[in-house]
């Protein structure tokens, strides 16, 4: 559309230029042409003649009339023919919008990664709205009552900095554009408790070339967090299922995790961690792809019997794709519940 | 006690511009999420632009384009930058802490008369 024309008349819209979609809607032509009676007046839509619906009120106005007026944006202008006049004259032109009302913001979530200095708040909009839809996001003090809000368009990131007055906060999201405003809950947020820690990275693995071989995978973060739970998944690149296990890790040196796989097999390793006891986990490592090393002599292959050592693993389970065709996606099909938490809780996902 | 002192309006002509101010004391100001709203005369208020304590803002479709509000963290004041300005906004404008809401609390506000 055109942000500003010099209109010889006006142009109005019932109910209004931004309105809701699906609504009947009627435009307004009035013309104030100077040395100019005109025969016709007509309306544009993004640059097409509009043949239908069109009124003729008096002498100056006219008036088009839509039934469900769906699209979300649009251009509408209006000319006018005038005897004598080869071309038709402009009269005047409007940008017209029609969306929703916002929803509810929902799944509000807050963290701090460790060492970003921000508190990294997030929701989900619910259905697109098609006109701008800003976001309020109120960030009150529980101990000081005191109250800062933030604008955002879909997430927002507040520099701890701004928190230093105290720990436990109250954290809710207002939605707001032209046709109405709507609140997420009220989130209760401390602190202290939805840190996440410093990403873990999986540096390398090793197979040894014992009887039985055994894979080494050695995994670090620059966490300072002192108490640490971790799970590593893994899985042959061939196979739909992952296999995860638990670990209480601690940082102050590299983690060595010991399995015995399948010889002569390529397997994907990824580890996440979360602060013990806490709610927020990290996302799935990058996948990190191992080629164990080929069976040199028959035996009995059983790769749960043996111990993990160096580690306080408790439970395998398995997590498995919903089907060839969407790699990517993960569920739990045999959820084993680790100290309180689901496997597949806020996975990243890779085949 | 949260001081809001409003200055700048004054009669203009259509087409002409303003810049209003509001000076604030009595809490952390670069900490503080503001809003400017206005009341014509035998009308309810109107919320008029939000601008969060990071410098974001927000405005209402009646003044999107036209006004711009800001803040300076330095002397703890809140603007609002008027052009284009029509009849219909004449009013009194009153600042507020807050990005968005149509009330306002205390302060005595400023006149803004557009007129030819």
């Known amino acids: 559309g055109i942000t500003s024309i010099n209109c010889s008349g006006d142009m109005w819209v019932e109910p209004g230029e931004i309105f809701q979609m699906g609504m009947n809607v009627s435009i307004y032509c009035q013309e104030a042409l100077k040395h100019c009676r005109p025969r016709n007046l007509y309306f544009y839509k993004n640059g097409f003649k509009e043949e239908f619906d069109i009124t003729r009120i008096n002498r100056t106005t006219a008036r088009i009339w839509y039934k469900g007026f769906s699209e979300p944006h649009a251009y509408m202008h209006c000319t006018a023919e005038c005897p004598g006049h080869f071309q038709e004259t402009l009269i005047c032109g409007k940008d017209i919008s029609s969306g929703h009302p916002p929803d509810a913001p929902s799944n509000l979530t807050c963290v701090i990664y460790e060492y970003s200095g921000n508190m990294t708040c997030t929701w989900n909009t619910g259905k697109p709205t098609y006109i701008d839809t800003k976001y309020i996001v109120h960030v009150k003090s529980l101990e000081t009552e005191e109250e800062q809000q933030y604008l955002a368009s879909s997430y927002v990131k507040i520099s701890t900095d701004s928190l230093q007055g105290s720990r436990k906060y109250l954290v809710w999201v207002q939605a707001v554009n032209s046709l109405g405003m709507e609140n997420s809950q009220q989130l209760h947020v401390h602190l202290d408790d939805i840190v996440i820690p410093s990403a873990s990275i999986i540096s390398r693995a090793e197979t040894t070339n014992d009887t039985v071989p055994k894979t080494i995978v050695y995994w670090k973060s620059k966490t300072m967090i002192e108490k640490v739970f971790c799970e590593m998944r893994y899985k042959t690149t061939t196979n739909q299922t992952w296999s995860v296990k638990e670990f209480d890790a601690n940082f102050t040196y590299v983690q060595q995790s010991e399995f015995y796989l399948e010889p002569d097999s390529k397997y994907v390793f990824q580890v996440r961690c979360q602060e013990t006891g806490k709610r927020n986990w990290q996302p799935w490592s990058s996948p990190f792809v191992h080629q164990t090393s080929q069976e040199t002599g028959k035996r009995n292959w059983q790769p749960w019997s043996s111990p993990f050592v160096h580690q306080t693993s408790q439970t395998v389970s398995q997590v498995t794709a919903k089907s060839s065709h969407e790699p990517q996606k993960m569920e739990m099909l045999s959820a084993t519940i680790f100290r309180g938490h689901p496997a597949s809780g806020n996975h990243q996902d890779i085949g | 006690q949260v001081q809001l002192q409003e200055s700048g309006g004054g009669l203009v002509q259509p087409g002409g511009s303003l810049r209003l101010s509001c000076a604030t004391s009595g809490f952390t100001f670069r900490l503080t999420a503001m809003r400017w709203v206005r009341q014509a005369p035998g009308k309810g208020v109107e919320w008029v632009s939000g601008i969060d304590s990071a410098g974001s803002t927000i405005y209402a479709d009646s003044v999107k384009g036209r006004f711009t509000i800001s803040k300076d963290n330095a002397k703890n004041t809140l603007y609002l930058q008027m052009n284009s300005l029509k009849t219909e906004d004449t009013a009194m404008y009153y600042c507020?802490?807050?990005?968005?809401?149509?009330?306002?609390?205390g302060s005595q506000g400023t006149q803004v008369t557009v007129s030819s």
């Open positions: 507020a802490q807050g990005v968005y809401g149509d009330t306002y609390s």
